[in-house]
């Protein structure tokens, strides 16, 4: 249930985020952290539906 | 796919402690934070607290030093504890994943309804 | 803790009709990252929550387009454009700005008239 760093804002997040590329803001310590410490759904296959829409990049939230 | 399964007694007498099992297939818990949500009679949702991905907890602190929420990562499988039950905490219990990205609630187990009684 | 107002508690609709819900918050839910974390379940009968709407107006995977959130700051409308039996349950607002801990609204039945 993990992605890779998340290397550029998107859209989504007017604010600059205090993480570097490799890491995520982690909301409930209010600190970056590896991103693979938080999950988010996976991809899936071509074709099926995603548990939330998602680009390749997402905003360090 | 995520699943999780609650399990546990489904009455627990007054001044007692209730102890909940939560079962997670498809992802480990070492990532995220895992939940413990109840909901009242009258539809009422509290939020209990968390075990994090490095271990750490949250307890709300309506519940006081009643809560404990603790994990096997060898099982992949994390618990609560609450002592001193009253019919007050008669509830349906609910574990939960958290979304790291939007940090809503995205996968939740079926619940199981514990009563307490004499 | 933030406190999740939502009205009416009971909301008969007819099947076809337009319902909408209110949630308000006791203080704003835009964080400082300019996000709002605010998100809808809906229960239905005998099932766990599911998530309908997250960060007050995208729609969660598979829900259908008549579903639609909006509001901002404190003030938030769940809209279903045309009741279907299969919408009926409690629709709850959750709050996920200033956690720990995560609060919800009261619940919102959606029945049949």
């Known amino acids: 249930m993990r992605r890779g760093p998340r290397s550029l804002r998107g859209r989504d997040a007017p604010a600059p985020t205090p993480c570097v590329p490799a890491e995520c803001f982690d909301l409930l310590v209010r600190h970056c952290v590896a991103c693979g410490a938080l999950r988010t759904p996976r991809p899936k296959p071509a074709g099926a539906s995603s548990p939330a829409p998602r680009t390749a990049l997402q905003p360090q939230e | 796919d995520v699943q999780l399964q609650e399990s546990g007694p489904s009455l627990v007498k007054p001044s007692q402690t209730l102890s909940l099992t939560c079962s997670v297939t498809g992802d480990s818990i070492t990532s995220g934070y895992w939940n413990w949500i109840r909901k009242f009679p009258g539809n009422k949702l509290e939020y209990m607290g968390y075990?994090?991905?490095?271990?750490?907890?949250y307890y709300n602190p309506s519940l006081k030093s009643r809560i404990s929420i603790t994990r096997d990562t060898s099982k992949n499988q994390f618990y609560l504890q609450l002592l001193s039950v009253t019919t007050e905490d008669t509830a349906t219990y609910y574990c939960?994943?958290?979304?790291?990205?939007?940090?809503?609630?995205?996968?939740w187990g079926a619940g199981t309804l514990v009563t307490v009684s004499s | 803790d933030i406190v999740m107002t939502q009205t009416p508690l009971s909301l008969p609709v007819s099947l076809g009709d337009q319902a909408s819900i209110s949630c308000r918050s006791s203080?704003?839910?835009?964080?400082?990252?300019?996000?709002?974390?605010l998100h809808w379940y809906l229960q239905k009968p005998g099932q766990s929550p599911k998530l309908l709407i997250y960060k007050v107006s995208n729609r969660f995977s598979g829900v259908p387009d008549r579903f639609s959130g909006s509001g901002s700051g404190t003030d938030f409308t769940l809209k279903i454009s045309r009741v279907e039996a299969e919408d009926l349950g409690v629709y709850f607002c959750s709050q996920s700005t200033h956690v720990p801990p995560f609060t919800f609204g009261s619940g919102t039945k959606l029945e049949i008239k």
């Open positions: 203080q704003s839910l835009v964080h400082s990252n300019g996000n709002t974390y």
């Open positions: 939960a994943g958290l979304d790291g990205l939007y940090w809503y609630f995205d996968v």
């Open positions: 075990i994090s991905y490095s271990g750490s907890t």
